[in-house]
Interface confidence: low
């Protein structure tokens, strides 16, 4: 069971990342599923490698104090939304913006229909060009 | 299957890495290998997770104004490359230069016969000291 | 074989990193264990994906002209410590300290009775905010 | 073939100073971290040191820190080992030893060069 899906530009106001497959993704069977476009859905229990990787190009005049910050999060059946994994970028003083990568991954058990998603400060600020924004998964 | 190998300083004036089987690193089998110091091969079709790290030290003045950007590419028997994953890190103003790490990881489906290798937009900012820079995959 | 701990604020002023079973981490079972806080040892010898995540507040005026840097280590029964990944990045400039991230991963052969731990430059300046700063490996 | 020749032990009185040398063919030496391993007598193995591949990192045993030194010149393919202010119980046979492939265990030693401490 694995999955990696490649980062989509969209309209929504809302901080969890959009994903697509499309370009070189993954989908290994139907035991993984991206469910609206936002979050990766597996149907059995287990271990998990999950990842993510985010590239964002911000400026510090332009943008908050606060740090850009990306966050890979876990909703599983009849429980509250978690943070997994969390890392944070200052951002760059180049004009007009600073290209910034980050990158997450860590081993997690998940339940039947758990889900996980991909939260960042600015949604605004993420780079959507071939092979900088991605996130995805594997079954131990 | 398993492979991690170690960056290797090279005259070349290539964009392309240049790796060594040296150090503490790990080739599990002859079903991958390194080929002309630039590139794993695998022997057999799957899922890999494929990651690369690269440490860099640059300096935004003496640097283009584009940042420094790291590609995991894939080259497939009969396909053109393509790029999998990319990261970018805008340079530094530290003087003479700023060090900053990029890790790039995914899994991707390999034919067999393909080629991963890691691009960067400035080899000559690579570090190469014991342990910054490095490169691998493993099969699921 | 897998395992997932979380970072802990020590007193201590030891550059190791300390760790805790804590939040939501994973230990598999008995192959693997956290030892003194600060070391995943492994019973079985293998392959090993072995990473570590980092994030960390800092600021250039307040800081080392060195970087940070955070080292992968091991220690395997009758050899010597030795450093397996490094990653470094130059301090902020953002008042009173910018944080950024830094995630280590990779294969490495380990023997029964190896450890892995964590070294930083100053662990002071490490963020034990949730999901920031993690360690973990999983056996291929 | 690897070949590791080790030279320069003998005897010499307490606090005093030996630098230990060794050759080394058939690799490439430069790819490698080394180290110095000694067996006193009647007695195990015991690690002394180990330097990186560039030499960059060095790593020594409790009992010899501060006092030894480990360096490497990769142009001359040779390892060294400076050991001052040397006690009785540095009495042993050193052996230079080079890591197997795949870093995991030395599988090369050299013949090994007795180093004495006695007044």
């Known amino acids: 069971i694995a999955a990696h899906v490649i980062s989509e530009a969209s309209s929504k106001t809302t901080s969890v990342l959009q994903w697509a497959e499309k370009g070189y993704y993954t989908m290994s069977n139907n035991l993984v599923t991206l469910e609206n476009g936002k979050q990766l859905t597996v149907k059995r229990q287990g271990l998990y490698y999950i990842y993510a990787q985010v590239t964002f190009c911000s400026n510090r005049e332009a943008s908050s104090q606060a740090p850009f910050i990306a966050s890979l999060c876990l909703k599983s059946p009849g429980r509250f939304e978690r943070i997994l994994l969390r890392a944070a970028n200052t951002h760059s003083s180049a004009k007009p913006c600073g290209q910034q990568s980050i990158h997450l991954g860590g081993v997690f058990e998940l339940q039947p229909g758990a889900s996980v998603f991909v939260n960042v400060t600015d949604p605004s600020q993420v780079s959507h060009g071939t092979g900088f924004t991605s996130f995805g998964l594997l079954k131990l | 299957i398993a492979a991690h190998v170690i960056s290797e300083a090279s005259s070349k004036t290539t964009s392309v890495l240049q790796w060594a089987e040296k150090g503490y690193y790990t080739m599990s089998n002859n079903l991958v290998t390194l080929e002309n110091g630039k590139q794993l091969t695998v022997k057999r079709q799957g899922l890999y997770y494929i990651y690369a790290q690269v440490t860099f030290c640059s300096n935004r003045e003496a640097s283009s104004q584009a940042p420094f950007i790291a590609s995991l590419c894939l080259k497939s028997p009969g396909r053109f490359e393509r790029i999998l994953l990319r990261a970018a890190n805008t340079h530094s103003s530290a003087k003479p230069c700023g060090q900053q790490s990029i890790h790039l990881g995914g899994v991707f489906e390999l034919q067999p016969g393909a080629s991963v290798f890691v691009n960067v937009t400035d080899p000559s900012q690579v570090s190469h000291g014991t342990g910054f820079t490095s490169f691998g995959l493993l099969k699921l | 074989i897998a395992a997932h701990v979380i970072s802990e604020a020590s007193s201590k002023t030891t550059s190791v990193l300390q760790w805790a079973e804590k939040g939501y981490y994973t230990m598999s079972n008995n192959l693997v264990t956290l030892e003194n806080g600060k070391q995943l040892t492994v019973k079985r010898q293998g392959l090993y994906y072995i990473y570590a995540q980092v994030t960390f507040c800092s600021n250039r005026e307040a800081s080392s002209q060195a970087p940070f840097i955070a080292s992968l280590c091991l220690k395997s029964p009758g050899r010597f410590e030795r450093i397996l990944l490094r990653a470094a990045n130059t301090h902020s400039s953002a008042k009173p300290c910018g944080q950024q991230s830094i995630h280590l991963g990779g294969v490495f052969e380990l023997q029964p009775g190896a450890s892995v731990f964590v070294n930083v430059t100053d662990p002071s300046q490490v963020s034990h905010g949730t999901g920031f700063t993690s360690f973990g490996l999983l056996k291929l | 073939e690897v070949q590791l020749l080790e030279s320069g032990g003998g005897l010499v009185q307490p606090g005093g100073s030996l630098r230990l040398s060794c050759a080394a063919s058939g690799f490439t030496f430069s790819n490698y971290e080394m180290g110095w391993v000694r067996q006193a007598p009647g007695k195990g193995l015991e690690w002394v040191s180990v330097i990186s591949e560039v030499g960059s990192l060095t790593y020594y045993a409790d009992s010899v820190k501060g006092r030894f030194t480990i360096s490497r010149d990769n142009s001359k393919n040779t390892l060294y080992l400076q050991m001052n202010s040397l006690r009785a119980e540095d009495t042993a046979v050193y052996y230079c030893?080079?890591?197997?492939?795949?870093?995991?265990?030395?599988?090369?030693w050299g013949q090994g060069t007795l180093v004495t401490v006695s007044s």
């Open positions: 030893a080079k890591p197997h492939d795949s870093s995991i265990g030395f599988d090369y």
